[in-house]
Interface confidence: low
C-alpha cells in the first residue's frame, strides 16, 4: 500500500511542467517503493538496485518506456509522440 506524501508542481517553464512527488509505501521484504502504471507501488528491490526502471512498468498502458541513457530515470512515450520524463533522486 502506498500514499503520496508531497506533490509540488512548477509550470514556470513554457511547454514543460516539472512535478516533484514523494510517496510513502508499506512494502513486503524484498520490495521497495516504486512506480507502476504511473502510480506509487511496491516493486522488486532488484529493479531499483539495477536501475532497470522500465521493469517496474512505470508507464500507462499503451505508452512506451525507455531508460534514460545514464539510468537516472525513464521516459514514457504516448502513442501521439508526447514524452514524459521521470528522474529518480
Amino acid at each position: 500500500t502506498c500514499e503520496i506524501v508531497t506533490l509540488d508542481r512548477d509550470s514556470s517553464q513554457p511547454r514543460r511542467t516539472i512535478a516533484r512527488q514523494t510517496a510513502r509505501c508499506a512494502c513486503r521484504k524484498g520490495q521497495i517503493a516504486g512506480t507502476t502504471r504511473a502510480r506509487p507501488a511496491c516493486v522488486d528491490a532488484r529493479i531499483i538496485k539495477t536501475k532497470q526502471w522500465c521493469d517496474m512498468l512505470p508507464c500507462l498502458e499503451g505508452e512506451g518506456c525507455d531508460l534514460l541513457i545514464n539510468r537516472s530515470g525513464w521516459t514514457c512515450t504516448q502513442p501521439g509522440g508526447r514524452i514524459k520524463t521521470t528522474t529518480v533522486s
Epitope: K51, G64, D66, L67, L68, I69, N70, R71, S72, G73, T75, T77, I83, T85, T87
Partner: antibody, heavy 115, light 110 residues
C-alpha cells in the same frame, strides 16, 4: 575486442553491409553502436542495438540504415541508396548500459562511395 | 533534434596549463554525456561517462563536470601526449533524442 569489416569502394546507389565482430564479451548483455567519420570531419552517431535487439537511430539515418544482430558475436550495419556523402570510416563501439559512454571501439572500416 | 554545441573548435596550450572544453546541449540531457579523445588515424577512446565518471586507466588530470545543459571537460596540467581532438557525446534517451556528438575541439600543445 571489436573489429569491423566489409568496407570497400562502391558506386552511388549501391547497397552495402558492414559487419562488426566481437570477442571477449557478449552481445546478449552489451549495447553496440555504429558511428561514422567522414575524412577530416567529426564523429557522427548512426544508431544502437540493445541486447534485446531493439534498435534506435539518429534521425538522419532512419530508413536508410539498419542495424541487426546476426549471431552471438556479430552485428551488421546495412546501408542502402549510398551517396558520396556516405564516404567515411565506420566504427562499431560497445556502449555501456549504465551511461552514454562507448568504452571499446574497433579500428574502423573505410567505405568510399564514388562514381 | 538534440544539438551539442562544443567550444572552442581549437586551442593551443603550454604543458602544465589547465584546459577547459565546454559542451552546451540544446535541451536538458540529465548528465547523459561522455567525453572522448581521438588521435590521428585512431578510433576514439572514452575518457569520461555520465558527465563526471572517469574511465578506468584514464589519468586523473582529466575531469568532467556539469549538469542540465552545460558540461565541461577539464584537463588539469596538460601534457604533450594530450594533443588530440576531443569530442563530447550527449543524449538522454535513445528513443527520443538518440546520441549527438559535438563538433570536436582540436588541442595543440605548444
Amino acid at each position: 575486442s571489436v573489429e569491423e569489416s566489409g568496407g570497400r569502394l562502391v558506386t552511388p546507389g549501391t547497397p552495402l553491409t558492414l559487419t562488426c565482430t566481437v570477442s571477449g564479451f557478449s552481445l546478449s548483455s552489451d549495447y553496440m553502436s555504429w558511428v561514422r567519420q567522414a575524412p577530416g570531419e567529426g564523429l557522427e552517431w548512426i544508431g544502437i542495438i540493445y541486447p534485446s535487439t531493439t534498435t534506435y537511430y539518429a534521425s538522419w539515418a532512419k530508413g536508410r540504415f539498419t542495424i541487426s544482430k546476426t549471431s552471438s558475436t556479430t552485428v551488421e550495419l546495412k546501408m542502402t541508396s549510398l551517396t558520396t556523402e556516405d564516404t567515411a570510416t565506420y566504427f562499431c563501439a560497445r556502449g555501456s548500459n549504465w551511461s552514454s559512454g562507448m568504452n571499446l571501439w574497433g579500428p574502423g572500416t573505410l567505405v568510399t562511395v564514388s562514381s | 533534434e538534440l544539438v551539442m554545441t562544443q567550444t572552442p573548435p581549437s586551442l593551443s596550450a603550454s604543458v602544465g596549463e589547465t584546459v577547459r572544453i565546454r559542451c552546451l546541449a540544446s535541451e536538458d540531457i540529465y548528465s547523459g554525456i561522455s567525453w572522448y579523445q581521438q588521435k590521428p588515424e585512431k578510433p576514439p577512446t572514452l575518457l569520461i561517462s555520465g558527465a563526471s565518471n572517469l574511465e578506468s586507466g584514464v589519468p586523473p588530470r582529466f575531469s568532467g563536470s556539469g549538469s542540465g545543459t552545460d558540461y565541461t571537460l577539464t584537463i588539469g596540467g596538460v601534457q604533450a601526449e594530450d594533443a588530440a581532438t576531443y569530442y563530447c557525446l550527449g543524449g538522454y534517451s535513445y528513443s527520443s533524442t538518440g546520441l549527438t556528438f559535438g563538433a570536436g575541439t582540436n588541442v595543440e600543445i605548444k
